[in-house]
């Protein structure tokens, strides 16, 4: 999907309004300085690239994100904003239901968490360089 | 600390695809980072193909982005770079690297791939 | 496409010299700003990342300012190590990363 068409400023207000309370409250119990940040992203449409595949795609050291609330107002805020997300979401939609129904948040886990609060910061950060 | 080695062929016939190898030692190319490919054609500067990040996203350079595939073995710890219809515009030295996913930290030594009949 | 012009092209200095390196971006792009070096036959090096900041292992003498367009890389006081090729790229552009052509510093 390409997000360069997203209205940047509303999905902005829901991060402030809400993911962002939820990812802060997935990553209660650790300190900032747990994990080190190690991507990052250049412009809007690349951290919401980056952000959605770190969200929706399972990886094997963490394959549950999908199901957190923060993951479920992410996609909510995607499809609302960014025309026809919703429509490239299908698959997204089946990884989501094949995510492991364990609510144990791992260290990994806490990791991936930790690198999505970074990719967030810098959308909110970066000025939109492409239109 | 990581150290990256890319491998293989040096000699690519035109309209043919190009493919090399990067192996990652020192750190688990799963656990965090981006692994791109940089280029460099002889006596030129340097241009940058594309990424596979840690979680398995992957960007390329539009110039090339119709031609070129980043994937990766996590059970061997490399990324692989595939890069279809060569022609002699895409001889050069083509680098593995570590990436943030905007600049980079570590480099392999290169590999030189020709593309001549 | 935002290109990314170094000058000059050639540098002739003395080890012991400053030595100052331009680059300038077609359009801004922010503190988003890289500096390599590359030696004969080796791979590029990261020296300087976001404009200013000293990758890891880098010494003092490499600085880096600038914001926007117009950046500098500077060497307070050449080593005769340092004789070799700099390169700045931009990482504002997303997917349109892109390095400058280089400015070779040689030995005078």
């Known amino acids: 999907y390409d997000f360069t068409n997203c209205d940047f400023q509303k999905i902005e207000a829901d991060y402030l309004r809400t993911i962002s309370k939820d990812l802060i409250t997935y990553m209660s119990g650790t300190k900032s300085t747990d994990f080190n940040n190690t991507v990052s992203c250049s412009n809007r449409p690349h951290c919401l690239t980056e952000i959605q595949s770190l969200t929706f795609n399972p990886t094997p050291r963490c394959a549950s994100l999908a199901k957190e609330m923060f993951a479920r107002k992410t996609k909510a805020t995607l499809a609302l904003w960014c025309p026809g997300y919703s429509e490239t979401q299908i698959n997204a939609t089946q990884a989501m239901k094949k995510a492991r129904k364990s609510k144990v948040t791992t260290n990994k886990c806490l990791e991936q968490v930790s690198q999505l609060l970074g990719l967030w910061r810098r959308f909110i950060r970066t000025l939109l360089k492409k239109q | 600390q990581v150290q990256l080695q890319e491998s293989g062929p040096g000699l690519v016939k035109p309209s043919e695809t190009l493919s090399l190898t990067c192996a990652v030692s020192?750190?688990?190319?799963?656990?965090?980072?981006?692994w791109s490919w940089i280029r460099q054609p002889p006596g030129k500067g340097l241009e940058w193909i594309g990424y596979?990040?840690?979680?398995?996203?992957?960007s390329y350079n539009p110039s090339l982005k119709s031609r070129v595939t980043i994937s990766r073995d996590t059970s061997k710890n490399q990324f692989s770079l595939k890069l279809s219809s060569v022609t002699a515009a895409d001889t050069a030295v083509y680098y593995c690297?570590?990436?943030?996913?905007?600049?980079?930290?570590?480099w392999g030594q290169g590999t030189l791939v020709t593309v001549s009949s | 496409e935002i290109v990314m012009t170094q000058s000059p092209a050639t540098l002739s200095l003395s080890p012991g010299e400053r030595a100052t390196l331009s680059c300038r971006a077609s359009?801004?792009?922010?503190?988003?700003l890289a500096w390599y070096q590359q030696k004969p036959g080796q791979a590029p090096r990261l020296l300087i990342y976001?404009?200013?900041s000293r990758a890891t292992g880098i010494p003092a003498r490499f600085s880096g300012s600038g914001s926007g367009t117009d950046f500098t890389l500077t060497i307070s006081s050449l080593e005769p190590e340092d004789f070799a090729v700099y390169y700045c790229?931009?990482?504002?552009?997303?997917?349109?990363?892109?390095f400058g052509q280089g400015t070779k510093v040689e030995i005078k």
């Open positions: 596979i990040s840690y979680y398995g996203s992957t």
């Open positions: 359009q801004s792009v922010s503190n988003n």
């Open positions: 690297a570590r990436t943030n996913l905007l600049y980079f930290d570590s």
């Open positions: 976001d404009a200013s």
């Open positions: 020192g750190y688990s190319i799963s656990s965090g980072y981006g």
């Open positions: 790229q931009q990482y504002s552009d997303w997917p349109e990363y892109s």
